[in-house]
């Protein structure tokens, strides 16, 4: 039979950050290769990563077509000898379906990890500091342009700013529905900042890791009386 001595894939895991989405699985192949298929709940299966010896497959191009859809993937284990006939012969020499394993369901909009944000700039004017968070580009497209994280998530995405005097450890916080903060500071004091992306309505993967810390007196800042 065409499926002898193949080992079904296992531990299928979605790895996704800011919609860059890769399916990973085990084991490393021995005398077999893998082909991945992906579909929405109501859609047709589409094959990707044909006859690969990798144990991962980048499915970003598929999921960004509609990030609010729920996707299912499956990984076929194909005997090495059957993988040389071209893409049209995914199935074994006698037409039987090779063993496969289903992934967990994955809804990008609800589950993709929020990437570590970056503080784009901060500017002090008197006792106010304007802090701007970089609006990172995603691989989601609309009208042939790549959308930013804010474009995709809209008001579902908020940012939390942590800020503190360089001379002390007591942190204050502010939140915003945009990518900007405007905070009160003490004149003559230097402050440090870190931001975190949050989607409060989520049940999983609600928060990003904190951005790198940026402090006044460094090159990203600007000071005006």
């Amino acid at each position: 039979s065409g499926t002898t001595n193949t080992v079904a894939a296992y531990n299928l895991t979605w790895k996704s950050t800011n919609f860059k989405t890769i399916l990973e699985w085990e084991p490393k192949p021995v005398n077999q290769v893998y082909t991945v298929q992906i579909s929405t709940k109501s859609g047709d299966w589409k094959s990707k990563c044909f006859y690969t010896t990798d144990t991962e497959c980048d499915l970003t191009d598929e999921i960004v077509k509609d990030v609010k859809q729920t996707y299912l993937a499956r990984v076929f284990s194909v005997p090495w000898r059957n993988s040389t006939h071209g893409k049209e012969t995914l199935f074994g020499t006698h037409g039987e379906e090779p063993p496969y394993e289903n992934s967990p369901e994955f809804t990008p909009y609800l589950e993709t990890n929020l990437g570590q944000p970056t503080i784009q700039s901060f500017e002090q004017v008197g006792t106010k500091v304007n802090v701007t968070v970089e609006d990172e580009r995603t691989l989601v497209r609309r009208n042939n342009t790549f959308l930013s994280l804010r474009d995709v998530f809209g008001k579902d995405l908020i940012y939390t700013l942590y800020y503190w005097k360089s001379s002390s450890s007591g942190k204050k916080t502010a939140k915003t529905n945009t990518n900007e903060f405007l905070i009160d500071v003490d004149k003559g004091e230097n402050y440090c900042f870190s931001v975190q992306a949050v989607i409060p309505s989520r049940t999983v993967n609600r928060k990003s890791t904190d951005s790198p810390v940026e402090c006044m007196g460094q090159e990203k800042g600007e000071f005006r009386e």
């Epitope: 609309r142 809209g154 529905n177």
Partner: antibody
Amino acid sequence: QVQLQESGPGLVKPSQTLSLTCTVSGGSISSGQYWSWIRQHPGKGLEWIGEIYYSGSTRYNPSLKSRVTISVDTSKNQFSLKLSSVTAADTAVYYCARDAPYYYGGGYYYYMDVWGKGTTVTVSS
Amino acid sequence: EIVLTQSPGTLSLSPGERATLSCRASESVDSSYLAWYQQKPGQAPRLLIYGASTRQTGIPDRFSGSGSGTDFTLTISRLEPEDFAVYYCQQAGVVPYTFGGGTKVEIK
């Protein structure tokens, strides 16, 4: 000075689709605000239908989500509402509104600060 | 959804009097997302207060907002003839955004 103007048929038959358009003048629809639809049943309070960002990102009221589509046309500076399978219960004044960011407590939050005059839609055969 | 209950339903007062309008939420609302609107007959609502306590530009200082958590208040310190209208509180922090049922301030 941003102004909003709703337009569309004032009478829709039951089971049909209600379609309204809101034209934005005096400002760009792509300038970082959100654009909302709200309705008010005769003699009643206000009900939020949903909102859209210029990028097409939407949020809908779950009670209407299965019937509502809000879309945006940046080239025409317009956004639209479609409500399918209407019944007499959808008879209301429909408002479009701008949701703009206002500074509060260190950050910026969105509030509906500019509204259209409203258009009355009656669902009747 | 968050239910906002306004009381009283109707407030009958004379010009010059103080009006106190209450808005109670079924669960805690972040003050950042709490707004008050005024609506007159045949007109669209008008934003008065945002962030529970900040007056929108051009709104007279006789209007003030306060409160946090589940209890919010709109106060009109001295009613002017043009203040007789319906007032709505609204939360825009949790989908669906919701409005209170409104308080009608009428001339006594």
